[in-house]
């Protein structure tokens, strides 16, 4: 922490300007009034402060606003945002998308994924839901940031907004997030024709249940292997060889290439070798002919 000293009269600060770059850390601490700093935050980013000097300015703001900065200060943080921790950001209440844009621009090129995720979370909380304007801002200024939100936050996305989400925005989403987004996407695109529907729903299919995947297999969609590999393991395992063949169409030969990757490997182990042989791909590891499959989980459920 910066030691407390009194400010020499000739160093007293009446406005935030470039002269401050010549102040030592302890002079900044002693001479800059936190309220003045907060009132003139819009000037800070134009001044080439060192990281050490920025530390002092942050310390000043922390003392003035122990419960979290007001949005009028947050909006003008500029490079001071790089000094913020997720714990700092968690105290904020942010509603303005202009504030979000400004800070996303600053964070670009810096290792700040945790801070950005927390900031986005605060914006969603502040605005009450993940509305279209927020989604548009995220897709424009921070592709992939949508997936930094928790499933709970994503549940506030209205289905009408799903159309604004691009495939690359979902690239880093995990299964739990896609579980939340998929039903919304299904609802949003339900009135589209088969091929158009598939193009739109494709990025969300990592959240699809088996019955929906089975339904797709009846629609000649020719799913590519990249999409198939993103399906939930639980959604793939119950599919028959015939259903997978119909689902993948000409892409079915890709199963051979991916046969050691999950979920393909797990699916192969559940199929009869006879059925796998009908694909003519040389897939190995299915249940040998003549073996009886007992599902013990069913027996346990009955007893």
């Amino acid at each position: 922490d910066v030691e407390r000293t009194t400010c020499p009269p000739e160093k007293e600060v009446h406005e935030i300007d470039e002269s401050l770059i010549f102040y030592k850390k302890r002079e900044l601490e002693a001479c800059v009034d936190a309220a003045l700093l907060a009132a003139q935050m819009d000037r800070v980013d134009a001044i080439p402060f060192t990281y050490e000097q920025l530390d002092v300015l942050k310390h000043k703001l922390d003392e003035l606003y122990p419960q979290g900065y007001p949005e009028s200060v947050i909006r003008h943080l500029g490079h001071l945002f790089l000094k913020m921790s997720p714990e700092d950001i968690r105290k904020w209440n942010v509603t303005s998308l202009e504030t979000l844009k400004a800070l996303l621009k600053v964070s670009k090129g810096h290792e700040m994924s945790a801070q950005v995720a927390t900031l986005i979370d605060r914006v969603v909380v502040g605005r009450g839901q993940l509305d279209k304007d927020t989604v548009d801002t995220l897709t424009a200024f921070c592709p992939g940031c949508l997936c930094s939100l928790s499933p709970e936050r994503l549940s506030s996305v209205p289905p009408s907004v799903i159309g604004a989400v691009r495939p690359q925005d979902l690239d880093t989403c995990g299964p739990r997030q896609l579980d939340v987004l998929y039903p919304k996407a299904r609802l949003a695109f339900q009135n589209m024709s088969g091929s158009e529907y598939f193009v739109k729903i494709r990025p969300f299919l990592g959240g699809a249940p088996t019955e929906d995947v089975k339904a797709l297999s009846q629609q000649n969609v020719s799913m590519d292997l990249a999409t198939f590999m993103k399906l939930r393991r639980e959604a793939v395992l119950p599919l028959t060889v015939a259903e997978v063949q119909k689902l993948l169409g000409p892409h079915v030969e890709g199963l051979k290439v991916e046969e050691q990757h999950s979920p393909v490997r797990d699916w192969i182990l559940k199929q009869r070798q006879d059925d796998l042989d009908t694909l003519g791909l040389g897939l190995q590891g299915g249940i040998p002919n003549g073996y009886l499959i007992l599902d013990l989980s069913v027996r346990e459920a009955l007893s």
Partner: antibody, heavy 119, light 108 residues
Framework: EVQLVQSGAEVKKPGASVKVSCKAS????????MDWVRQAPGQGLEWMGD????????IYNQKFNGRVTMTEDKSASTVYMELSSLRSEDTAVYYC????????????WGQGTTVTVSS | EIVLTQSPDFQSVTPKEKVTITCSAS???????LSWYQQKPDQSPKLLIY???NLASGVPSRFSGSGSGTDYTLTINSLEAEDAATYYC?????????FGGGTKVEIK
């Protein structure tokens, strides 16, 4: 423009480990597996294994029995290949190569990372 | 593992001449799962042909591929100076993926 940019050259002592990174840009990262191929000086190409960035699932060439580990960071569109217990025969250029999931050919390659193992 | 044997190892050819490189597999390879790469000195390999006979994007039509089972061929119909390189066949029909030993083509 699709690009794979690899980390810089490394010089390591026998027994050490090396970790090479490969940053992808210009395409949907999770639609392609990333494979690693190495080439010893004056020699041919040798496939080391691959990683599916969507699931993090890996397949390794058994020749590298437990010495190779491939990982990914989806948020940074980057994959890593770590080779441990290095020996002089591991001196090579290491390439990452993009492979569309469901195909086996590599349509885009990184520039290569030279790893020299010498005492 | 499937061993791919290329021949010849080295070929010195005059421009406009036809070049044929063969790739012989130790066991049968599904033809959809064979490709060819070109590698110039101090450069990364570049995809030339995939699925035995399909030309990769931007590859001149003088290159062609054919074959099935255990025998595959890369043909350069009318060699140009820029084709001086080492050529590798590659199979992904079974694990581990393997490459041929390479054929170096030199311009006379």
């Amino acid at each position: 423009e699709v690009q794979l940019v690899q980390s810089g050259a490394e010089v390591k002592k026998p027994g050490a480990s090396v970790k090479v990174s490969c940053k992808a840009s210009g395409y949907t990262f999770t639609d392609y597996n990333m494979d690693w191929v190495r080439q010893a000086p004056g020699q041919g190409l040798e496939w080391m294994g691959d990683i599916n960035p969507s699931t993090g699932g890996t397949i390794y060439n058994q020749k590298f029995n437990g010495r190779v580990t491939m990982t990914e960071d989806k948020s940074a569109s980057t994959v890593y290949m770590e080779l441990s217990s290095l020996r002089s025969e591991d001196t090579a250029v290491y390439y990452c190569a993009r492979r569309r999931i469901g195909t086996g050919y590599f349509d885009v390659w990184g520039q290569g990372t030279t790893v020299t193992v010498s005492s | 593992e499937i061993v791919l044997t290329q021949s010849p190892d080295f070929q010195s050819v005059t421009p406009k001449e036809k070049v044929t490189i063969t790739c012989s597999a130790s066991s049968s390879v599904i033809s959809s799962y064979l490709s060819w790469y070109q590698q110039k000195p101090d450069q990364s390999p570049k995809l030339l042909i995939y699925r035995t006979s399909n030309l990769a994007s931007g590859v001149p039509s003088r290159f062609s591929g054919s074959g099935s089972g255990t025998d595959y061929t890369l043909t350069i119909n009318s060699l140009e100076a820029e084709d001086a390189a080492t050529y590798y066949c590659h199979q992904w029909s079974s694990f581990p993926y393997t490459f041929g030993g390479g054929t170096k083509v030199e311009i006379k």
